[in-house]
């Protein structure tokens, strides 16, 4: 068995980095769907909701087969970071329709941070670049009103399941080329 | 334009009930969760309660929980508050208020209600 | 008592700045929006500032907002005889599930 959870990892073995990089991705996928389930199911969604200020999905079916470590590793943390900023807006903007979601936003928020800790310390034991690429950050303005601030929720947390499910594929496919 | 008009304050007994309307038009209720604030005379505003834009989730003020009773009516764009077991310390004008998220945007004028025997 | 904490009065001259402050905790402030209010005599409350630092359409920028930690404060700079009025901070409380406000701040112009 490795080490406790939350001690230190000696090795430096990037495959052994990766593999509790995708658990803990995994881990925040199931929190992620989960969530998205008990959302759907207190409000439920009529169709697709998209938010401009939301990150464009980085990796797709087709692009799998080109993908290289280290511009896998640098967007997604660069898009964990805007999906921990929405996070964070919607526990803070939300208004009393989300606050009934509170404990487990606040647990997603908890997890996310978590994950990106991990990525953080994969990428400088890779010896990586830490800086993350100029990007405009866009302020997140107030929700229109509290529907708007369910559909805001709706569009943040299908992004954030579909974002994690293809950085789990990505990250098991690297580490077969490491 | 946005208008939030209360009604149904007035002078009431101790231990009696009473119920407030707020009647909202010029945008779409059913899409902003609303709220009740209240002040009592020469004091502060004081929250009262709140309810979800589709009425499903409701939060509540120490003060009022138990007797008071948020609810609405988004067919007829009416906010209501049931008032029961009232005290002389709930004397106060009370205003309905929407809000997009975490603050009050637009405000009814408020309405008196009087607690006393 | 408030569970927000406002100094009960603040005076100023005309063309004077004035600083509200409002105290608060890691529940309230520290993990949520302050908002102001303005309270003009014998009115209903008015959104003055939210989301911190932000400020409604018709409200003069000579009214801003700042947040640090579990404490805000509201600045007017050039004061006006039409600012005296009641003002209010408030944000939801995690703890209490619930809208909190400050005691409020009766504001003169002398």
């Known amino acids: 068995p490795g080490p406790p959870a939350g001690s230190p990892r000696v090795s430096s073995d990037p495959r052994a980095d990766l593999d509790s990089a995708v658990l803990l991705t995994r881990s925040l996928l199931a929190d992620t769907r989960q969530l998205a389930a008990q959302m759907r199911d207190k409000f439920p969604a009529d169709g697709d909701h998209s938010l401009d200020s939301l990150p464009t999905l980085a990796m797709s079916a087709g692009t799998l087969g080109s993908l290289q470590l280290p511009g896998v590793l640098t967007r997604l943390r660069v898009d964990l970071m805007s999906y921990l900023r929405h996070v964070q807006w919607l526990r803070r903007a939300g208004g009393p329709s989300l606050k009934t979601l509170e404990p487990e936003l606040g647990a997603l928020q908890a997890r996310l941070e978590r994950l990106l800790r991990r990525l953080q310390l994969l990428m400088s034991r890779l010896a990586l670049p830490q800086a993350a690429p100029d990007q405009p950050v866009i302020p997140l303005g107030p929700p229109a009103s509290a529907w708007g601030s369910i559909r805001a929720a709706h569009a943040i947390l299908g992004g954030l399941h579909l974002t994690l499910d293809w950085a789990v594929r990505g990250l098991l496919l690297l580490k077969t080329r490491l | 334009q946005v208008q939030l008009v209360e009604s149904g304050g007035g002078v009431v007994q101790p231990g009696r009930s009473l119920r407030l309307s707020c009647a909202a038009s010029g945008f779409t209720f059913s899409h902003y969760d609303m709220h009740w604030v209240r002040q009592a005379p020469g004091k502060g505003l004081e929250w009262v309660a709140v309810?979800?834009?589709?009425?499903?989730?409701?939060f509540y003020a120490d003060s009022v929980k138990g007797r008071f009773t948020i609810s609405r009516d988004n067919s007829k764009n009416t906010l209501y508050l049931q008032m029961n077991s009232l005290r002389a310390e709930d004397t106060a004008v009370y205003y309905c208020a929407r809000t997009p998220g975490s603050h009050f945007d637009y405000w009814g004028q408020g309405t008196l209600v009087t607690v006393s025997s | 008592q408030s569970v927000l904490t406002q100094p009960p009065s603040a005076s100023g001259t005309p063309g004077q700045r004035v600083t509200i402050s409002c105290s608060g905790s890691s529940s309230n402030i520290g993990s949520n929006y302050v908002n102001w209010y303005q309270q003009l005599p014998g009115t209903a409350p008015k959104l003055l500032i939210y989301y911190d630092n932000l400020r409604p359409s018709g409200v003069p920028d000579r009214f801003s907002g700042s947040k640090s930690g579990t404490s805000a404060s509201l600045a007017i700079s050039g004061l006006r005889s039409e600012d005296e009025a009641d003002y209010y901070c408030?944000?939801?409380?995690?703890?209490?599930?619930?809208?909190?406000f400050g005691g409020g701040t009766k504001l003169t112009v002398l």
């Open positions: 408030a944000a939801w409380d995690d703890s209490l599930s619930g809208v909190v």
């Open positions: 309810i979800s834009y589709e009425g499903s989730n409701k």
